[in-house]
Amino acid sequence: NKILVKQSPMLVAYDNAVNLSCKYSYNLFSREFRASLHKGLDSAVEVCVVYGNYSQQLQVYSKTGFNCDGKLGNESVTFYLQNLYVNQTDIYFCKIEVMYPPPYLDNEKSNGTIIHVKGKHLCPSPLFPGPSKP
């Protein structure tokens, strides 16, 4: 028995930040779980982790240097990533493990979300004016 995960196929991070919502076919209310976001086709980099516990507030952390936060819904976890770099454009996969109460459940691998990080647009300097309007 596997949890199904839905993600947006693609997101664009215009200001180096993005909200990625992971929607699950499972209600996380009153469960103890570990939701995580992984970068790359091989999911080699664990970008962000959200630990949910029925009796404590959400624990959110990254061991890989990402600036992240998390928000919990009944059947979703939203990861808010900030200070992304252009070279962090990649495919990102949501993962969920429900530990308690048993039985242990995890998800079928999702299709992932391509996060396209656009560089910050700098205001044109007066010495180097941008293209003039017609």
Epitope: R34, E97, Y100, P101, P102, P103
Partner: antibody
Framework: EVQLVESGGGLVQPGGSLRLSCAAS??????????VGWIRQAPGKGLEWIGE???????YYSPSLKSRVTISRDNSKNTLYLQLNSLRAEDTAVYYC????????????WGQGTLVTVSS | DIQLTQSPSSLSASVGDRVTITCRAS??????????LHWYQQKPGKAPKLLIY???SLQSGVPSRFSGSGSGTDFTLTISSLQPEDFATYYC?????????FGQGTKVEIK
């Protein structure tokens, strides 16, 4: 046949660290369906759950020990490890690893245990 | 944390006696009709051995004189006819919530 064999116990100084091993055979630590936990028993006392590791590598710890404990594994050796830091006399115990199934989380196979004595 | 309280802490019995040990949880350990409460037997110098899982299911290889019952917060381990090899300490354990917790144990001694 499922077997769990702990090693690494002995005398440790207060403030020191211990690293215990649990060699598993008869099943794979990285295959779904089962996980492995660590449980300890102080001399003449009851059983205390330390933490566990799932096939995915995710770990779960007892809140009272979380700041001092790390459970890890080496899939190539099918071996589990328990690292416990800042040891004190109260950590003196027999340390067991035990396998649990994912449906009920009952510990169906146990190692023989390894004794750790924390003393100067 | 879920506290498990076993009673009695110790008991003296004779071979052939019917023995009952109770385990009370500080909150329900039931979920979707399953009680996540297990019983173990431990002999001196040995590792615990699983006897009963999910409150009433007999672990493979365990003699049928052992049985478990109960749901919610109140559970019972019964040994229908005590045998010499049954003198040991018995523990209940819950796996409904983390941290997993054990009862303090019940020592069954020879009368």
């Amino acid at each position: 046949e499922v077997q769990l064999v702990e090693s690494g116990g002995g005398l440790v100084q207060p403030g020191g660290s211990l690293r215990l091993s649990c060699a598993a055979s008869g099943f794979s630590l990285s295959t779904g369906g089962v996980g492995v936990g660590w449980i300890r028993q102080a001399p003449g006392k009851g059983l205390e759950w330390i933490g566990e590791i799932y096939h995915s590598g995710s770990t779960y710890y007892s809140p009272s020990l979380k700041s001092r404990v790390t459970i890890s594994r080496d899939n190539s050796k099918n071996t589990l490890y328990l690292q416990l830091n800042s040891l004190r006399a109260e950590d003196t115990a027999v340390y067991y690893c035990a396998r649990y199934g994912y449906y009920y989380y009952d510990f169906d196979y146990w190692g023989q245990g390894t004794l750790v004595t924390v003393s100067s | 944390d879920i506290q498990l309280t076993q009673s009695p802490s110790s008991l003296s019995a004779s071979v052939g006696d019917r023995v009952t040990i109770t385990c009370r949880a500080s909150q329900s350990v039931d979920f979707h009709g399953i009680s996540f409460l297990h019983w173990y037997q431990q002999k001196p110098g040995k590792a615990p051995k699983l006897l009963i899982y999910a409150a009433s299911s007999l672990q493979s290889g365990v003699p049928s004189r052992f049985s478990g019952s109960g749901s919610g917060t109140d559970f019972t381990l019964t040994i229908s006819s005590l045998q010499p090899e049954d003198f040991a300490t018995y523990y209940c354990q819950q796996s409904y919530r983390s941290p997993r917790t054990f009862g303090q144990g019940t020592k069954v001694e020879i009368k």
